[in-house]
């Protein structure tokens, strides 16, 4: 079982390989000096049907380096960064993992593209392994709350309350969504 020639790349090169390309072979892409690699640089020859070989993902691309590009902080609700830090310049990558009791959909890594957007795929999502969700929490008088998403919230996520200036928060500042679908505490109040 073998794979066909790896997909070509413009303004870059492919690592050495011999033919036939055996299943298990890795080929690596790189870009010419003034270009930045966007996407996974390694492709693996696999077989899904034990008959034909296929490459496990699309080839990356080489973008002409844009020194003015910068990407915003990427947020994945229920997830956290395991690699990558600000500032995010053209070609920089960020890799995510999911919190406990969350599973990942999509690709764990994204790259800062010349258009100031993360790609070449969408940001991954972290989905709760529990079907239960906690209901949306109410806003409080003279205060605000921040949550990692809007509406009902998956177990493992939290909401943080704060009060307007001149008001004191009474109760729990951070309330966690439990795996039971219940909140860990009642909303606090803001008192003068």
């Amino acid at each position: 079982i073998s794979c066909g020639s790896p997909p070509p790349i413009l303004n870059g090169r492919i690592s050495y390989y011999s033919t036939p390309i055996a299943v298990g072979t890795v080929i690596r892409y790189s870009c010419s000096g003034t270009f930045r690699l966007i996407g996974e640089k390694s492709l693996l020859c696999i077989t899904k049907d034990k008959v034909d070989g296929t490459w496990d993902k699309p080839a990356p691309k080489c973008e002409y380096f844009n020194k003015y590009s910068s990407c915003p902080e990427p947020i994945v609700p229920g997830g956290y960064k395991i690699r990558g830090s600000t500032p995010y310049r053209h070609g920089d990558s960020v890799t995510f993992a999911c919190k406990t009791n969350f599973s990942m959909n999509g690709n764990k890594s994204v790259w800062c593209q010349a258009n100031n957007m993360w790609g070449p795929t969408r940001l991954p999502t972290c989905v709760s392994v529990f079907p239960l969700e906690c209901p949306a929490l109410p806003m409080i008088h003279n205060g605000h709350h921040t949550s990692e998403n809007v509406g009902s919230i998956a177990p493992g996520l939290s909401v943080t309350y704060s009060c307007e200036s001149g008001y004191l928060l009474v109760g729990e500042k951070i309330i966690n969504c439990l795996s039971s679908g219940k909140w860990s505490a009642v909303p606090p109040t803001c008192e003068e």
């Epitope: 690592s15 050495y16 690596r28 996974e40 390694s42 696999i46």
Partner: antibody, heavy 119, light 106 residues
Framework: QVQLVQSGAEVKKPGSSVKVSCKAS????????ISWVRQAPGQGLEWMGR????????NYAQKFQGRVTITADKSTSTAYMELSSLRSEDTAVYYC????????????WGQGTLVTVSS | EIVMTQSPATLSVSPGERATLSCRAG??????LAWYQQKPGQAPRLLIY???TRATGIPARFSGSGSGTEFTLTISSLQSEDFAVYYC????????FGQGTKLEIK
């Protein structure tokens, strides 16, 4: 960080086989490749082959083709290297090593297993 | 297979001085090169990958450079714990290691 713990030292007779294990803890066993690298006494490092557990695909260095078998048990997060038709020149420390996402380099190594081949 | 040649076989340097280790590939390997440190009785430890990127937790005194066929590992100011054997490894086409350079105290 992934920890790789290997089985203990072995003494073998020429012509026999040896099977060394490498148990991984931490990280997702299926998502990385495990290579086997050996080092004869006072010598350098020599790549023998590697397996990608999630695919069950093993590849071997030409020198060891036909004599080495690398397998993995996903249920126990353990990789195995079996070397047959042993000769005295196979006396070495055998290491398992992990590469992440087909990176090509080894972030984590086992502690090594000394295999002595002697009559 | 791609042959990796390291030089010198042994390098004697005084603590606090700079050490420069070389690695040559038998054909172009782009930047697909890693450096490892190995001390007696221990497994190798990853220092540098992609020719010039320091691995997590590796001190800034270690730096790598080069691409194509010529590569260098530089240790800017040698500490006592840096005396060891250093190996380069290519991953352009499967995997091969250099024969090693022993860095010893002068």
């Amino acid at each position: 960080q992934v920890q790789l713990v290997q089985s203990g030292a072995e003494v073998k007779k020429p012509g026999s086989s040896v099977k060394v294990s490498c148990k991984a803890s931490g990280g997702t066993f299926s998502s990385y490749a495990i290579s086997w690298v050996r080092q004869a006494p006072g010598q350098g490092l020599e790549w023998m082959g590697r397996i990608i557990p999630i695919l069950g695909i093993a590849n071997y260095a030409q020198k060891f083709q036909g004599r080495v078998t690398i397998t993995a048990d996903k249920s126990t997060s353990t990789a195995y290297m079996e070397l047959s038709s042993l000769r005295s020149e196979d006396t070495a420390v055998y290491y398992c090593a992990r590469e992440d996402d087909s990176s090509g380099y080894y972030q984590d190594w086992g502690q090594g297993t000394l295999v002595t081949v002697s009559s | 297979e791609i042959v990796m040649t390291q030089s010198p076989a042994t390098l004697s340097v005084s603590p606090g001085e700079r050490a420069t280790l070389s690695c040559r590939a038998g054909q172009s390997i782009n930047s697909h090169l890693a450096w490892y440190q190995q001390k007696p009785g221990q497994a190798p430890r990853l220092l540098i990958y992609d020719a010039s990127t320091r691995a997590t937790g590796i001190p800034a005194r270690f730096s790598g450079s080069g691409s194509g066929t010529e590569f260098t590992l530089t240790i800017s100011s040698l500490q006592s714990e840096d005396f060891a054997v250093y190996y380069c490894q290519q991953y352009e086409y499967w995997y091969t290691f250099g024969q090693g350079t022993k860095l010893e105290i002068k």
